[in-house]
Protein backbone atom coordinates (compact mmCIF):
# COMPACT_ATOMS: atom_id res chain seq x y z
CA UNK A 1 0.00 0.00 0.00
CA UNK A 2 1.00 3.60 -1.00
CA UNK A 3 0.30 6.59 1.28
CA UNK A 4 -1.24 9.20 -0.83
CA UNK A 5 0.60 12.37 0.59
CA UNK A 6 0.33 16.31 -0.13
CA UNK A 7 3.00 18.87 -0.15
CA UNK A 8 1.82 22.62 0.57
CA UNK A 9 3.14 25.66 -1.41
CA UNK A 10 2.14 28.99 0.16
CA UNK A 11 2.30 31.40 -2.42
CA UNK A 12 0.75 35.50 -2.67
CA UNK A 13 -1.51 36.34 -5.94
CA UNK A 14 0.19 36.96 -8.86
CA UNK A 15 3.09 34.60 -7.70
CA UNK A 16 3.86 31.42 -9.92
CA UNK A 17 3.29 27.92 -8.68
CA UNK A 18 5.99 25.79 -10.51
CA UNK A 19 6.56 21.93 -9.76
CA UNK A 20 7.79 19.03 -10.95
CA UNK A 21 6.01 15.89 -11.67
CA UNK A 22 8.69 13.04 -11.95
CA UNK A 23 7.47 9.65 -13.74
CA UNK A 24 9.09 6.22 -15.16
CA UNK A 25 10.38 7.21 -18.73
CA UNK A 26 10.64 3.82 -20.08
CA UNK A 27 6.79 3.45 -19.41
CA UNK A 28 5.22 7.17 -19.88
CA UNK A 29 7.06 9.23 -21.70
CA UNK A 30 5.19 9.69 -24.65
CA UNK A 31 1.73 9.14 -22.64
CA UNK A 32 -0.69 12.27 -22.32
CA UNK A 33 -0.51 13.96 -19.38
CA UNK A 34 -2.67 15.89 -17.24
CA UNK A 35 -2.74 18.71 -14.39
CA UNK A 36 -6.17 18.43 -12.26
CA UNK A 37 -8.05 20.01 -9.33
CA UNK A 38 -9.65 17.87 -6.68
CA UNK A 39 -12.32 19.98 -5.06
CA UNK A 40 -14.19 18.73 -2.24
CA UNK A 41 -16.96 16.01 -2.99
CA UNK A 42 -16.17 16.39 -6.80
CA UNK A 43 -13.98 14.01 -8.86
CA UNK A 44 -10.89 15.60 -10.02
CA UNK A 45 -10.74 18.13 -12.92
CA UNK A 46 -8.79 18.31 -15.72
CA UNK A 47 -7.36 21.56 -16.12
CA UNK A 48 -4.97 21.11 -18.86
CA UNK A 49 -3.51 18.11 -21.01
CA UNK A 50 -0.37 17.69 -22.84
CA UNK A 51 -0.75 16.68 -26.24
CA UNK A 52 -1.29 12.78 -27.64
CA UNK A 53 0.86 11.82 -27.70
CA UNK A 54 2.53 13.62 -25.69
CA UNK A 55 5.52 15.95 -27.17
CA UNK A 56 9.29 16.62 -26.06
CA UNK A 57 9.64 19.75 -24.68
CA UNK A 58 6.84 21.27 -26.03
CA UNK A 59 5.28 23.76 -24.23
CA UNK A 60 1.34 23.14 -24.04
CA UNK A 61 -0.58 26.56 -22.22
CA UNK A 62 -4.25 26.48 -21.46
CA UNK A 63 -5.06 29.69 -19.65
CA UNK A 64 -2.50 29.82 -16.68
CA UNK A 65 -1.14 26.60 -16.68
CA UNK A 66 1.91 25.96 -18.71
CA UNK A 67 2.49 22.11 -19.12
CA UNK A 68 6.19 20.90 -20.47
CA UNK A 69 6.91 17.05 -20.61
CA UNK A 70 10.53 16.48 -20.52
CA UNK A 71 10.65 13.02 -21.98
CA UNK A 72 14.53 12.45 -21.89
CA UNK A 73 14.34 13.24 -18.28
CA UNK A 74 10.63 11.59 -17.16
CA UNK A 75 9.44 15.07 -15.69
CA UNK A 76 6.34 17.05 -16.67
CA UNK A 77 6.58 20.80 -15.62
CA UNK A 78 3.64 22.56 -14.52
CA UNK A 79 3.90 26.31 -14.10
CA UNK A 80 0.16 27.98 -12.59
CA UNK A 81 1.59 31.74 -13.66
CA UNK A 82 -0.39 35.37 -12.23
CA UNK A 83 -1.90 33.19 -9.36
CA UNK A 84 -5.33 34.03 -7.74
CA UNK A 85 -7.18 33.42 -4.20
CA UNK A 86 -9.67 31.58 -5.87
CA UNK A 87 -6.57 28.79 -7.00
CA UNK A 88 -5.94 27.58 -3.90
CA UNK A 89 -6.78 23.70 -3.71
CA UNK A 90 -5.44 20.40 -3.97
CA UNK A 91 -3.81 19.45 -7.33
CA UNK A 92 -2.25 16.33 -9.01
CA UNK A 93 -0.58 15.46 -12.07
CA UNK A 94 -1.91 12.42 -14.03
CA UNK A 95 -1.17 10.32 -16.83
CA UNK A 96 -3.57 9.08 -19.10
CA UNK A 97 -3.08 5.28 -20.68
CA UNK A 98 -6.18 3.92 -22.26
CA UNK A 99 -7.81 1.96 -22.17
CA UNK A 100 -6.58 1.87 -18.35
CA UNK A 101 -7.36 4.31 -15.68
CA UNK A 102 -4.95 7.01 -15.09
CA UNK A 103 -2.29 6.92 -12.90
CA UNK A 104 -1.19 9.58 -10.47
CA UNK A 105 1.90 10.61 -9.91
CA UNK A 106 3.48 11.76 -6.34
CA UNK A 107 2.87 14.35 -4.99
CA UNK A 108 -0.56 16.08 -4.45
CA UNK A 109 0.10 19.76 -4.21
CA UNK A 110 -1.98 21.87 -1.67
CA UNK A 111 -1.91 25.61 -3.34
CA UNK A 112 -2.51 27.91 -0.84
CA UNK A 113 -2.98 31.73 -1.97
CA UNK A 114 -3.34 34.88 -0.06
CA UNK A 115 -3.55 38.17 -0.68
CA UNK A 116 -0.79 40.53 -1.57
CA UNK A 117 1.91 40.50 -3.41
CA UNK A 118 5.55 39.89 -1.07
CA UNK A 119 8.27 40.08 -3.82
CA UNK A 120 11.38 42.21 -3.16
CA UNK A 121 13.31 44.59 -5.35
CA UNK A 122 14.31 43.72 -8.67
CA UNK A 123 11.86 40.39 -8.55
CA UNK A 124 10.44 39.71 -12.00
CA UNK A 125 7.47 37.46 -10.77
CA UNK A 126 5.37 39.51 -12.14
CA UNK A 127 6.64 40.89 -15.03
CA UNK A 128 4.84 40.21 -18.08
CA UNK A 129 7.92 39.37 -20.44
CA UNK A 130 8.65 36.87 -17.67
CA UNK A 131 5.08 35.19 -17.62
CA UNK A 132 4.57 35.53 -21.38
CA UNK A 133 7.61 34.24 -22.91
CA UNK A 134 6.19 30.69 -23.44
CA UNK A 135 3.71 31.13 -27.28
CA UNK A 136 1.27 30.31 -26.44
CA UNK A 137 -0.38 27.31 -27.73
CA UNK A 138 -2.94 24.85 -26.15
CA UNK A 139 -3.58 21.51 -26.76
CA UNK A 140 -4.84 20.39 -30.78
CA UNK A 141 -7.07 17.65 -29.11
CA UNK A 142 -9.66 18.09 -25.99
CA UNK A 143 -8.64 16.43 -22.94
CA UNK A 144 -10.08 12.48 -22.97
CA UNK A 145 -12.67 11.97 -21.19
CA UNK A 146 -12.67 8.84 -19.50
CA UNK A 147 -15.86 7.28 -17.30
CA UNK A 148 -14.81 5.29 -14.66
CA UNK A 149 -15.91 1.82 -14.03
CA UNK A 150 -16.84 2.54 -10.71
CA UNK A 151 -18.36 5.35 -9.27
CA UNK A 152 -17.35 7.87 -7.04
CA UNK A 153 -19.47 8.83 -3.95
CA UNK A 154 -17.06 10.55 -1.58
CA UNK A 155 -14.08 12.82 -2.19
CA UNK A 156 -11.05 12.27 -2.92
CA UNK A 157 -9.37 12.29 1.00
CA UNK A 158 -7.87 15.77 2.28
CA UNK A 159 -4.79 13.73 4.11
CA UNK A 160 -3.71 10.46 3.62
CA UNK A 161 -4.91 7.73 2.12
CA UNK A 162 -3.79 3.49 1.22
CA UNK A 163 -3.92 3.25 -2.12
CA UNK A 164 -2.12 0.34 -4.19
CA UNK A 165 0.62 1.27 -6.65
CA UNK A 166 2.48 -0.14 -9.68
CA UNK A 167 5.86 1.21 -9.37
CA UNK A 168 5.71 5.05 -8.89
CA UNK A 169 2.57 5.84 -9.87
CA UNK A 170 -0.99 5.63 -7.98
CA UNK A 171 -3.20 4.07 -9.95
CA UNK A 172 -6.74 6.13 -10.24
CA UNK A 173 -10.02 5.45 -9.52
CA UNK A 174 -11.72 8.03 -11.58
CA UNK A 175 -11.48 10.82 -14.23
CA UNK A 176 -12.62 13.87 -15.24
CA UNK A 177 -14.28 16.50 -17.18
CA UNK A 178 -12.21 19.49 -18.54
CA UNK A 179 -12.14 23.08 -17.83
CA UNK A 180 -10.71 25.17 -20.48
CA UNK A 181 -9.60 28.71 -20.26
CA UNK A 182 -9.08 31.51 -23.00
CA UNK A 183 -5.62 31.45 -23.32
CA UNK A 184 -3.35 34.94 -23.34
CA UNK A 185 -2.66 36.71 -26.23
CA UNK B 1 8.65 9.16 10.57
CA UNK B 2 11.07 9.70 6.99
CA UNK B 3 14.63 8.52 8.25
CA UNK B 4 17.42 7.31 6.49
CA UNK B 5 20.50 6.35 7.52
CA UNK B 6 24.10 6.00 5.29
CA UNK B 7 27.35 3.75 6.02
CA UNK B 8 30.14 2.33 4.07
CA UNK B 9 32.02 5.43 4.57
CA UNK B 10 35.72 5.06 5.56
CA UNK B 11 39.83 5.41 4.58
CA UNK B 12 40.46 4.67 0.89
CA UNK B 13 43.59 5.30 -0.73
CA UNK B 14 43.65 7.88 -3.88
CA UNK B 15 42.62 5.92 -6.94
CA UNK B 16 40.20 3.37 -4.86
CA UNK B 17 37.11 2.52 -4.48
CA UNK B 18 34.36 2.70 -1.75
CA UNK B 19 30.79 1.95 -1.94
CA UNK B 20 28.42 4.07 0.10
CA UNK B 21 25.10 2.91 1.10
CA UNK B 22 21.73 4.79 2.49
CA UNK B 23 18.92 2.60 3.75
CA UNK B 24 15.20 4.51 3.73
CA UNK B 25 12.10 4.15 5.85
CA UNK B 26 9.19 5.51 6.69
CA UNK B 27 8.03 6.93 3.31
CA UNK B 28 7.16 5.22 0.22
CA UNK B 29 10.37 4.85 -0.81
CA UNK B 30 10.02 3.88 -4.86
CA UNK B 31 7.98 7.25 -5.10
CA UNK B 32 10.77 9.60 -4.52
CA UNK B 33 13.41 10.48 -6.37
CA UNK B 34 16.88 9.86 -3.64
CA UNK B 35 20.23 12.02 -3.73
CA UNK B 36 23.85 12.69 -2.65
CA UNK B 37 25.13 15.56 -1.11
CA UNK B 38 28.51 15.97 -0.09
CA UNK B 39 30.25 18.50 2.14
CA UNK B 40 34.60 18.88 2.68
CA UNK B 41 35.39 19.59 5.66
CA UNK B 42 34.37 23.15 6.54
CA UNK B 43 33.30 23.66 3.16
CA UNK B 44 29.67 24.24 1.75
CA UNK B 45 27.12 21.56 0.37
CA UNK B 46 27.97 20.05 -3.27
CA UNK B 47 24.89 18.21 -4.84
CA UNK B 48 26.62 14.95 -6.00
CA UNK B 49 24.24 12.80 -8.07
CA UNK B 50 20.19 12.07 -8.26
CA UNK B 51 18.08 9.02 -9.09
CA UNK B 52 14.50 9.07 -9.91
CA UNK B 53 11.98 7.01 -8.28
CA UNK B 54 11.70 3.80 -10.20
CA UNK B 55 15.51 4.70 -10.99
CA UNK B 56 15.24 5.36 -14.87
CA UNK B 57 16.95 8.40 -14.58
CA UNK B 58 19.83 9.23 -12.95
CA UNK B 59 21.70 12.62 -12.28
CA UNK B 60 25.74 13.78 -11.89
CA UNK B 61 27.58 16.74 -11.24
CA UNK B 62 30.76 17.04 -13.30
CA UNK B 63 33.02 16.72 -10.66
CA UNK B 64 31.84 12.88 -10.55
CA UNK B 65 31.04 11.74 -14.26
CA UNK B 66 31.98 8.80 -14.82
CA UNK B 67 33.78 7.84 -11.50
CA UNK B 68 30.28 7.68 -9.29
CA UNK B 69 27.56 5.27 -10.27
CA UNK B 70 24.19 5.62 -8.17
CA UNK B 71 21.41 3.22 -8.21
CA UNK B 72 18.77 1.76 -5.98
CA UNK B 73 16.97 -1.17 -4.85
CA UNK B 74 13.17 -0.53 -4.30
CA UNK B 75 12.48 -4.09 -3.39
CA UNK B 76 15.01 -3.22 0.04
CA UNK B 77 14.39 0.59 -0.03
CA UNK B 78 17.93 0.79 0.08
CA UNK B 79 20.11 3.69 -1.99
CA UNK B 80 23.87 3.14 -2.92
CA UNK B 81 26.76 5.24 -4.56
CA UNK B 82 29.75 3.50 -6.07
CA UNK B 83 32.66 5.46 -6.28
CA UNK B 84 35.51 4.73 -8.54
CA UNK B 85 39.24 6.59 -9.19
CA UNK B 86 38.79 8.30 -5.68
CA UNK B 87 40.11 11.79 -5.45
CA UNK B 88 41.59 13.61 -2.06
CA UNK B 89 39.12 16.28 -3.63
CA UNK B 90 36.24 13.55 -2.69
CA UNK B 91 36.99 13.66 0.88
CA UNK B 92 33.95 14.89 2.27
CA UNK B 93 30.76 13.94 4.73
CA UNK B 94 28.51 12.18 2.09
CA UNK B 95 24.88 12.36 3.01
CA UNK B 96 21.70 10.42 1.74
CA UNK B 97 18.73 12.79 0.81
CA UNK B 98 15.23 12.24 0.14
CA UNK B 99 14.15 14.62 -2.55
CA UNK B 100 10.69 15.97 -2.25
CA UNK B 101 7.53 14.81 -4.09
CA UNK B 102 7.34 17.88 -6.14
CA UNK B 103 10.61 19.61 -7.15
CA UNK B 104 14.25 19.00 -6.66
CA UNK B 105 15.05 20.05 -2.84
CA UNK B 106 15.66 17.81 -0.13
CA UNK B 107 13.20 17.41 2.56
CA UNK B 108 14.93 14.55 4.68
CA UNK B 109 18.63 14.02 5.41
CA UNK B 110 20.91 11.52 6.82
CA UNK B 111 23.02 12.03 9.46
CA UNK B 112 26.35 11.52 6.74
CA UNK B 113 29.43 9.13 6.25
CA UNK B 114 32.62 10.11 6.22
CA UNK B 115 34.49 9.91 3.24
CA UNK B 116 38.72 10.05 3.56
CA UNK B 117 40.58 9.56 0.31
CA UNK B 118 43.94 10.04 1.63
CA UNK B 119 47.70 7.86 1.00
CA UNK C 1 25.32 26.43 -14.28
CA UNK C 2 23.21 29.09 -12.17
CA UNK C 3 25.36 30.68 -9.41
CA UNK C 4 24.14 31.21 -5.91
CA UNK C 5 25.78 33.57 -3.81
CA UNK C 6 24.77 34.62 -0.21
CA UNK C 7 25.92 37.41 1.85
CA UNK C 8 26.82 38.04 4.37
CA UNK C 9 29.53 35.38 4.87
CA UNK C 10 28.70 35.92 8.47
CA UNK C 11 26.22 37.64 10.34
CA UNK C 12 26.69 38.80 14.33
CA UNK C 13 23.22 39.18 15.96
CA UNK C 14 22.28 39.24 19.62
CA UNK C 15 19.29 37.09 20.72
CA UNK C 16 15.84 38.48 20.19
CA UNK C 17 17.21 40.71 16.99
CA UNK C 18 16.23 40.01 13.80
CA UNK C 19 18.47 38.54 10.96
CA UNK C 20 18.22 38.89 7.53
CA UNK C 21 19.79 37.01 4.97
CA UNK C 22 20.25 37.24 1.74
CA UNK C 23 20.86 34.63 -1.54
CA UNK C 24 21.15 35.99 -5.40
CA UNK C 25 21.35 33.62 -8.20
CA UNK C 26 23.04 34.41 -11.75
CA UNK C 27 19.85 33.88 -13.25
CA UNK C 28 16.19 34.07 -12.93
CA UNK C 29 14.94 30.81 -11.04
CA UNK C 30 11.07 32.12 -10.30
CA UNK C 31 10.37 31.04 -6.77
CA UNK C 32 12.67 27.64 -7.03
CA UNK C 33 14.74 28.12 -4.02
CA UNK C 34 15.04 26.25 -1.02
CA UNK C 35 16.62 27.33 2.43
CA UNK C 36 18.45 25.53 5.03
CA UNK C 37 19.64 25.38 8.43
CA UNK C 38 22.81 23.23 9.42
CA UNK C 39 24.67 23.00 13.28
CA UNK C 40 28.10 21.71 13.93
CA UNK C 41 28.14 18.09 13.17
CA UNK C 42 24.50 18.08 11.98
CA UNK C 43 22.96 17.22 8.42
CA UNK C 44 21.19 20.02 7.29
CA UNK C 45 17.69 20.36 8.19
CA UNK C 46 15.28 21.98 5.16
CA UNK C 47 13.28 25.11 6.61
CA UNK C 48 11.89 26.48 3.29
CA UNK C 49 10.71 25.44 -0.01
CA UNK C 50 9.31 27.42 -3.27
CA UNK C 51 11.08 30.62 -1.68
CA UNK C 52 7.66 30.70 0.64
CA UNK C 53 6.94 28.21 2.12
CA UNK C 54 7.91 27.03 5.46
CA UNK C 55 8.88 23.30 5.58
CA UNK C 56 6.87 21.26 8.52
CA UNK C 57 7.64 21.83 11.95
CA UNK C 58 9.29 24.91 11.28
CA UNK C 59 8.77 27.76 13.64
CA UNK C 60 6.66 31.09 12.19
CA UNK C 61 9.45 33.18 13.23
CA UNK C 62 11.31 32.04 9.92
CA UNK C 63 10.45 33.39 6.42
CA UNK C 64 10.98 33.73 2.92
CA UNK C 65 10.53 35.95 -0.01
CA UNK C 66 11.51 37.13 -3.39
CA UNK C 67 11.60 35.51 -6.67
CA UNK C 68 13.60 35.94 -9.80
CA UNK C 69 16.95 36.47 -8.46
CA UNK C 70 16.95 37.93 -4.96
CA UNK C 71 15.86 35.61 -1.96
CA UNK C 72 15.88 36.56 1.77
CA UNK C 73 15.50 34.46 4.80
CA UNK C 74 14.34 36.19 7.43
CA UNK C 75 14.93 35.12 10.91
CA UNK C 76 12.00 37.59 13.30
CA UNK C 77 13.39 36.71 16.32
CA UNK C 78 16.87 34.89 16.83
CA UNK C 79 16.83 31.90 19.63
CA UNK C 80 19.68 30.41 20.98
CA UNK C 81 19.07 27.46 18.78
CA UNK C 82 18.90 29.56 15.33
CA UNK C 83 22.94 30.08 15.34
CA UNK C 84 24.14 27.98 12.87
CA UNK C 85 25.21 28.33 8.97
CA UNK C 86 22.25 28.67 6.47
CA UNK C 87 21.88 27.49 2.74
CA UNK C 88 20.47 28.33 -0.18
CA UNK C 89 19.63 26.22 -2.82
CA UNK C 90 17.74 26.17 -6.41
CA UNK C 91 15.89 23.73 -8.30
CA UNK C 92 14.69 25.71 -11.33
CA UNK C 93 14.83 22.73 -13.79
CA UNK C 94 17.87 20.41 -14.71
CA UNK C 95 20.94 19.64 -12.70
CA UNK C 96 22.95 20.54 -11.43
CA UNK C 97 21.35 21.75 -8.45
CA UNK C 98 23.70 24.56 -6.49
CA UNK C 99 23.78 25.51 -3.39
CA UNK C 100 25.27 29.24 -2.41
CA UNK C 101 28.43 29.12 0.11
CA UNK C 102 26.59 29.47 3.17
CA UNK C 103 26.13 32.52 5.97
CA UNK C 104 26.93 31.59 9.34
CA UNK C 105 24.96 33.08 11.91
CA UNK C 106 26.95 34.03 15.05
CA UNK C 107 25.95 35.38 18.51
CA UNK C 108 26.85 39.26 18.77
Known amino acids: ATKLTEEKYELKEGQTLDVKCDYTLEKFASSQKAWQIIRDGEMPKTLACTERPSKNSHPVQVGRIILEDYHDHGLLRVRMVNLQVEDSGLYQCVIYQPPKEPHMLFDRIRLVVTKGFSGTPGSNENSTQNVYKIPPTTTKALCPLYTSPRTVTQAPPKSTADVSTPDSEINLTNVTDIIRVPVFN | EVQVLESGGGLVQPGGSLRLSCAAS????????MSWVRQAPGKGLEWVSTISGSGSTTYYADSVKGRFTISRDNSKNTLDLQMNSLRAADTAVYYC????????????WGQGTLVTVSS | EIVMTQSPATLSVSPGERATLSCRAS??????LAWYQQKPGQAPRLLIY???TRATGIPDRFSGSGSGTEFTLTISSLQSEDFAVYYC??????????FGQGTKVEIK
Open chain 2, 97 to 108: AKVAGSNFFFDH
Open chain 3, 27 to 32: QSINSN
Open chain 3, 50 to 52: GAY
Open chain 3, 89 to 98: QEFIMFPPWT
Open chain 2, 26 to 33: GFTFNAYA
